[in-house]
């Protein structure tokens, strides 16, 4: 089958500081040297790009400076971290992988990771 399978966890719970991490793993049908990873958020049938990074195999992922994502790569596995999440950001986060170079191009889209974000309770006023 000339397709690329992408695996990611079904559910992740963000930390109380609004940070969520998950692994995106892809089964590469070719020997890519350049890979692009995009995180998409799907909510109410609307799709938005959360962040994207292109990296050379063996090198680190480089997201834009103002990106809410960071990540590291190891072989065909990408460890993604999304920061600054709030309860309203709860949704399905989909990992999309593209083998950019050399040809042929391959596209792989994961089933998505449902990220649950719970805003921390405000600290009660202290009498001390």
């Amino acid at each position: 089958c000339k397709a690329m399978h992408v695996a990611q966890p079904a559910v992740v719970l963000a930390s109380s500081r609004g940070i969520a991490s998950f692994v995106c793993e892809y089964a590469s049908p070719g020997k890519a040297t350049e890979v692009r990873v995009t995180v998409l958020r799907q909510a109410d049938s609307q799709v938005t790009e959360v962040c994207a990074a292109t990296y050379m195999m063996g090198n680190e992922l480089t997201f834009l400076d103002d990106s809410i994502c960071t990540g590291t790569s190891s072989g065909n596995q990408v460890n993604l971290t999304i920061q600054g999440l709030r309860a309203m950001d709860t949704g399905l986060y989909i990992c999309k992988v593209e083998l950019m170079y050399p040809p042929p191009y391959y596209l792989g889209i994961g089933n998505g990771t449902q990220i649950y974000v719970i805003d921390p309770e405000p600290c009660p006023d202290s009498d001390f």
């Epitope: 089958c1 000339k2 397709a3 690329m4 399978h5 049908p29 350049e34 692009r36 995009t38 998409l40 799709v47 790009e49 994207a52 292109t54 999309k96 593209e98 950019m100 170079y101 040809p103 042929p104 191009y105 391959y106 596209l107 889209i109």
Partner: antibody, heavy 118, light 108 residues
Framework: QVQLVESGGGVVQPGRSLRLSCAAS????????IHWVRQAPGKGLEWVAV????????HYADSVKGRFTISRDNSKNTLYLQMNSLRAEDTAVYYC???????????WGQGTLVTVSS | EIVLTQSPGTLSLSPGERATLSCRAS???????LAWYQQKPGQAPRLLIY???SRATGIPDRFSGSGSGTDFTLTISRLEPEDFAVYYC?????????FGQGTKVEIK
Amino acid sequence: QVQLVESGGGVVQPGRSLRLSCAASGFTFSSYGIHWVRQAPGKGLEWVAVIWYDGRNKHYADSVKGRFTISRDNSKNTLYLQMNSLRAEDTAVYYCARQDYWGPFDYWGQGTLVTVSS
Amino acid sequence: EIVLTQSPGTLSLSPGERATLSCRASQSVSSSYLAWYQQKPGQAPRLLIYGASSRATGIPDRFSGSGSGTDFTLTISRLEPEDFAVYYCQQYGSSPWTFGQGTKVEIK
């Protein structure tokens, strides 16, 4: 709203060159791969070329490799197709199309006709 | 290169009838990466179905897609006058991007 508008088509002699343009609006141009697809008169759709995101990566159909060059100017939201050494079999309507996040081509231009004839 | 073969070449039907269009791939295609387009004379193609079975924005529910592996189907449950057109399948999981040769749905 998303719009793609092609221009630059016309009649050209075999062996000559032509440059097509595709002006995009209504979306973040640099976040999408953009393709050229052509359709010979009365025939089906044939993929021609694609250029990705920042413009560094490109892929071509074997039928145009070495003759056609795809490029983009993200500051102008414009896609180009430089067509050299044109042949009669390159006669077609040329469409630019946006590849959406999931992979299919969700928006197409109206097309521009290229006729290669002596 | 994945070759897509559509059948039949032409389908002659009346409004209100059901249309079943077939697309067969030369090798297995992930259903996530199979699309259907509609094209009317003098117009650009329009995306109908992606991921083999998901309807694109604004596409009426009389259009449905199904299939996996090498065999895919586009079904139009009840043909409306505006549905008479040429339909193309496409795979977009790997380069080169390929289209079927098209099926023309014409009025009987």
